[in-house]
């Protein structure tokens, strides 16, 4: 007799996902060796448990300690790169700027960053078929907490200067139901944090505004503000001329505005 | 079986470029960091880079940094590593070369290699 | 970057007598995960390198058990129990702690 199975309006678990995790695991400890004494095995382990043979609505942050503290990792505080809506360029930036991190320079980031998974309540198989949407769906699923933990953590960790890239060809540049607005934003220490400052990304070649005084940049001075950290702002009119400059910062052409 | 195969010998003119290539099969492309390693004749080995394949993400030697370009096709299941304004010292055999995986922990050792691909260069 | 030292450049031997290279690192190889990166490679003329040793001690898969490693710290060494014609070539450590990779200069086993 078939079990009946539940349907979820979201794309199923990324296929190969056990090989995924495990090989993204030891490439990451092969060119980071400040983490290899971290079992692979064990975080797989950690991950699986997380979210295995529970209800993939019912998932809590606690689910996922035990995989928290194996990928326990520190990076320089002062460093961190957060991005919203704007992820492949941020990355292209750490990769040229090697001493600043974004979450997903980061063991846990790494190991999950493009993947989607799910299980089934009092089932150990994992659900290839379907996973929850958050939308439409629910919000406490397996992608979902994962990334908030992680971020949460991530967004914890910061001090000094905390850098934010932000995608200025969207409606709302910072948007505050993104993993950003929601999450790290909330979650930065004032103690700790002196200042936010955003870089707002240009799409357009002929956009010459001044986006840092959107609304939606007004807004997110404001919330920043109250929590008693600095705001500052600066427009990348030019992102490829921007990732030119961080790599040759002295090529002529890179003291003008970008 | 896992095998590492390098596109042909090259002679190149001094300050042009070369471009190898290691085409990888038995195994999945992804799931590997791919390094590049030199040996100039009778001289030792040297390390040059490595690429993710993955995610395309690099890290050069020092040494390398300004001229040598590691990228990869994902479809083909193929690393390439670009050498820019050749040098009389960079005619050299050119490897690729994989670690292996000992019970889910990378051995840190290069244990595949590619059978190498000569670059000469001249004036 | 961490310098690889081998003695002897040269090493002359009798079939069927043991062999021994030396190799020692700037700093030590040893990992807070207990394991210690120094690998030993062979490369016969003409061929690309071959992995015989990893984390100081293990043999690589299919190496003969006549290839053996030890040391500690920064001092180790590659011994063949009783040589044989096929093990005519070079013979490099290289460490892989920290990036960059890197290797000794080799050191060429020939037979007498």
């Known amino acids: 007799v078939p079990r009946w199975r539940q349907q979820w309006s979201g794309p199923g678990t990324t296929k190969r996902f056990p090989e995924t995790v495990l090989a993204r695991c030891v490439k990451y400890t092969e060119i980071h060796p400040e983490m290899r004494h971290v079992d692979c095995q064990s975080v797989w382990d950690a991950f699986k448990g997380a979210f295995i043979s529970k209800h993939p609505c019912n998932i809590t942050e606690e689910d996922y300690q035990p995989l928290m503290k194996l990928g326990t990792q520190t990076v320089p505080c002062n460093k961190i790169l957060l991005w919203s809506r704007i992820k492949d360029l941020a990355h292209q930036f750490t990769q040229v700027q090697r001493d600043m991190f974004t979450l997903e320079d980061t063991l846990l980031g790494y190991l999950a960053d493009d993947l989607t998974w799910c299980g089934e309540f009092n089932t150990s198989k994992i659900n290839y078929q379907s996973c929850p949407d958050w939308r439409k769906d629910c919000s406490n699923n397996p992608v979902s907490v994962f990334w908030k933990t992680v971020s949460r953590r991530f967004a914890e960790a910061a001090c000094d200067v905390v850098h934010v890239m932000l995608n200025g060809s969207r409606s709302k540049i910072f948007d505050k139901n993104s993993t950003f607005g929601s999450v790290e934003v909330h979650n930065l220490q004032p103690e700790k944090v002196q200042t936010l400052e955003a870089w707002v990304i240009h799409g357009g070649r002929e956009d010459s505004r001044d986006l840092c005084q959107d609304p939606t940049i007004k807004e997110l001075e404001s919330i920043i503000s109250k929590r008693n950290i600095q705001f500052s702002c600066k427009n990348i009119y030019r992102p490829d001329k921007f990732l030119q400059c961080v790599k040759n910062p002295e090529d002529s052409s890179c003291t003008s505005e970008i | 079986q896992m095998q590492l195969v390098q596109s042909g010998a090259e002679v190149k003119k001094t300050g042009s470029s070369v471009k190898v290539s290691c085409k990888a099969s038995?195994?999945?492309?992804?799931?590997?960091?791919m390094h590049w390693v030199r040996q100039a004749p009778g001289q030792a080995l040297e390390w040059m880079g490595w690429i993710d394949p993955e995610y395309g993400s690099t890290d050069y030697a020092q040494k390398f940094q300004d001229r040598v370009t590691i990228t990869r096709d994902r479809s083909m299941s193929t690393a390439y590593m670009e050498l820019s304004s050749l040098r009389s010292e960079d005619t050299a055999m050119y490897y690729c070369a994989r670690v292996a995986i000992i019970t889910t922990v990378a051995s840190g050792g290069f244990a595949y290699w590619g059978q190498g691909t000569l670059v000469t260069v001249s004036s | 970057d961490i310098v690889m030292t081998q003695t002897p450049l040269s090493s002359p031997v009798t079939l069927g007598q043991p062999a021994s290279i030396s190799c020692q690192s700037s700093e030590s190889l040893l990992h807070s995960n207990g394991k210690t990166y120094l690998n030993w490679l062979q490369q016969r003329p003409g061929q690309p390198p071959r992995l015989l040793i990893y984390?100081?001690?293990t043999r690589a898969a299919g190496v003969p058990d006549r290839f053996s490693g030890s040391g500690a710290g920064t001092d180790f060494t590659l011994k063949i129990s009783r040589v044989e014609a096929e093990d005519v070539g070079v013979y490099y450590c290289q460490q892989f702690l920290e990036y960059p990779p890197t290797f000794g200069q080799g050191t060429k086993l020939e037979i007498k």
């Open positions: 984390w100081m001690s």
């Open positions: 038995g195994y999945t492309f992804t799931d590997y960091i």
